[in-house]
């Protein structure tokens, strides 16, 4: 028999999503207005291009990157788009409320949209750990909680540690990774007998996942430079990110071959390791003074990524129930930490260069910032995981994990796949 959405979810999802959308529309109506001072139309177009790059990364890049499951590729791409669309709306409001609201209405600029898209990207990174095991109603909850947690984290870090937009957004890698892993830890883990084939990758979806990786690879320099405030910072960020991702591609492909007894290249390793350099240089991409340093970072990041992809999936599958192909979570957690360590090294150099005797204090502040990001990610992730386990969401039965047919109408299929 063809699998349908359970009746209760069929009632619950549209009601839940549309009520939320109506609430968002009302909030936009009462509390927002456009920036009226956009006088330079050419500048407007240039500014929009950055936002466009970020949207391509999110919708196509992360959408397709997570689509490698044999029987869950449709859901991966479309659910990602759904979460992005919802996440951006909520992030624009939340950022406005947190940063501008005391002065009256929230002013929406192209920068607001850029910032909101990056916040929503956090959810798309995290969700890789749980896609296939949750329905859309649950994903709505995840979007709301994660975007709220990230927005508040950024505000706290900005106020306490005096960091700019770029610096506090670059915690996104570590935050998203730990958030996703902690949500996954809360969800039912064992895959019942007979469904193991569903979380395997297939050739066509793997090709689309590679396409996603390529889009991310092409636009990662835009992501790392999007929130920087001066042309020189952006130029450095673009160059350094490009060098780092270029080297991590070479490292990923050769390292993957090296890691295999027969010297074969693993698609899964490559999907994620090609991005390794971009994640590792994220925090300090505008500060790295020369290309060779960015390239060395890309090399190290590629090796870490391939090593992690080889040895961590077993552990993650047992403990967190994350399938072998969903390696973004632990990949980003390791590489995000590497990026933060690089920044701490730069901070030490800065403090020494200034002849400042407060090295310990500065490093402690930076470690405090990172720890805060991890703690908030873990706590909000666990909270989300607990919420997602509530019966009201009518989560897919374990036997229906990684199954597009639970969610999609396939007219050409009477039964099964």
């Amino acid at each position: 028999m063809s699998s349908k959405y359970p009746r209760s979810v069929r009632r619950c999802l549209p009601l839940w999503a549309l009520t939320l959308e109506a609430a968002l529309i009302l909030l936009f109506y009462f509390f927002t207005h456009y920036d009226a001072s956009l006088e330079d139309q050419k500048g407007l177009v240039a500014s929009y291009q950055v936002g466009q790059d970020l949207t391509v990364m999110a919708a196509i890049g992360l959408g397709f990157l997570t689509s490698s499951f044999r029987r869950h590729s449709w859901s991966s791409v479309a659910f990602n788009l759904f979460m992005l669309a919802l996440g951006v709306q909520w992030a624009i409001l939340l950022d406005g409320f947190l940063s501008q609201f005391p002065s009256g209405k929230v002013v929406i600029t192209l920068f607001s949209i850029r910032l909101a898209t990056m916040s929503a990207l956090s959810v798309l990174i995290s969700v890789d750990a749980v896609l296939g095991k949750v329905n859309l109603a649950q994903l709505v909850v995840m979007v709301l909680v994660e975007v709220t947690a990230l927005g508040n984290l950024r505000m706290v870090i900005s106020n306490i540690f005096n960091t700019d937009y770029h610096m506090n957004m670059m915690h996104i890698y570590v935050f998203a990774a730990y958030f996703g892993l902690s949500v996954a830890w809360c969800l039912p883990k064992p895959l019942p007998e007979g469904t193991e084939d569903k979380d395997q990758t297939a050739t066509i979806p793997s090709l689309s996942a590679m396409l996603g990786a390529l889009f991310l690879w092409m636009f990662w320099p835009s992501f790392n430079s999007a929130l920087l405030r001066s042309p020189i910072e952006r130029k450095n960020a673009v160059f350094n990110t490009y060098y780092a991702v270029a080297v991590s591609v070479v490292t990923a492909i050769s390292g993957s071959s090296l890691a295999h007894p027969q010297g074969k290249i693993s698609k899964t390793y490559v999907h994620s390791a090609v991005l390794a350099g971009g994640v590792a240089v994220g925090t300090s991409c505008h500060l790295i003074p020369s290309p060779w340093l960015a390239m060395v970072l890309g090399l190290v990041a590629g090796l870490i990524s391939v090593g992690g992809a080889k040895y961590l999936p077993g552990c993650c599958n047992r403990v967190l129930g994350i399938p072998h192909s969903s390696i973004m979570g632990y990949n980003f957690s390791l590489l995000g930490l590497l990026g933060e360590i690089i920044y701490i090294v730069l901070l030490v150099l800065d403090t020494v260069g200034a002849g400042n005797g407060m090295i310990g204090f500065q490093v402690l502040l930076s470690i405090g910032e990172l720890s805060l990001a991890i703690v908030i990610a873990l706590m909000s992730g666990l909270l989300t995981g607990l919420l997602l386990n509530l019966k009201i969401w009518k989560a897919p039965h374990e036997a229906k994990y990684f199954d597009d047919q639970v969610f999609w109408k396939f007219p050409h299929l009477a039964v099964g796949f």
């Epitope: 920068f111 937009y165 003074p289 920044y343 730069l346 260069g353």
Partner: antibody, heavy 125, light 108 residues
Amino acid sequence: QVQLVESGGGVVQPGTSLRLSCAASGFTFRTYGMHWVRQAPGKGLEWVAYIWYDGSNKYYADSVKGRFTISRDNSKSTLNLQMNSLRAEDTAVYYCAREIASRGYSRYLYYFDSWGQGTLVTVSS
Amino acid sequence: DIQLTQSPSSLSASVGDRVTITCRASQSISSYLNWYQQKPGKAPKLLISAASSLQSGVPSRFSGSGSGTDFTLTISSLQREDYATYYCQQSYSTPPYTFGQGTKLEIK
């Protein structure tokens, strides 16, 4: 050489509006962040507003938030400050200033390397 | 917001004197501090960036030092054209970019 020329100052009543402009020349305007800084008579310097080089992001001092709007037209190399709901305490000489960024190890240092001659705004009933 | 406190708020000195102005930040700002000079009726002029980097065209009698929370501007041998008001400004945090309240240097 770098030149910044402010205009639009004058005497206005409280609650009214005024628009200041700053015409830039001698450098590539579109590649620099720009600021407005003011100085009340006999007082120190107070930073007012800042706009990114591409106009995509803006910051304001708490004292002017919601009343002042900074904008720029890179095609005309002009910086503007729209001042609404003016108060007596907004009386000051308003300077536009160009921002320079230079790289440190762990963050960039920003400073104002060029200033205009200033334009006086007097808010009085 | 980071607060900057300059001392003294005014001082009198003679030509040839060595003058020191201090600026204290409410929290560590590493070396992200700039010094400006302003003469009456004129716009401010950048003297020193990054606590100790002298700008081109600024006489070498001006020097800056310090890091963390305590900074100093020193004029090794005061000249007549140095009588002005001096401001420190931090750019460690995101805007607002606070200035010190100023130090007025007068002829004795």
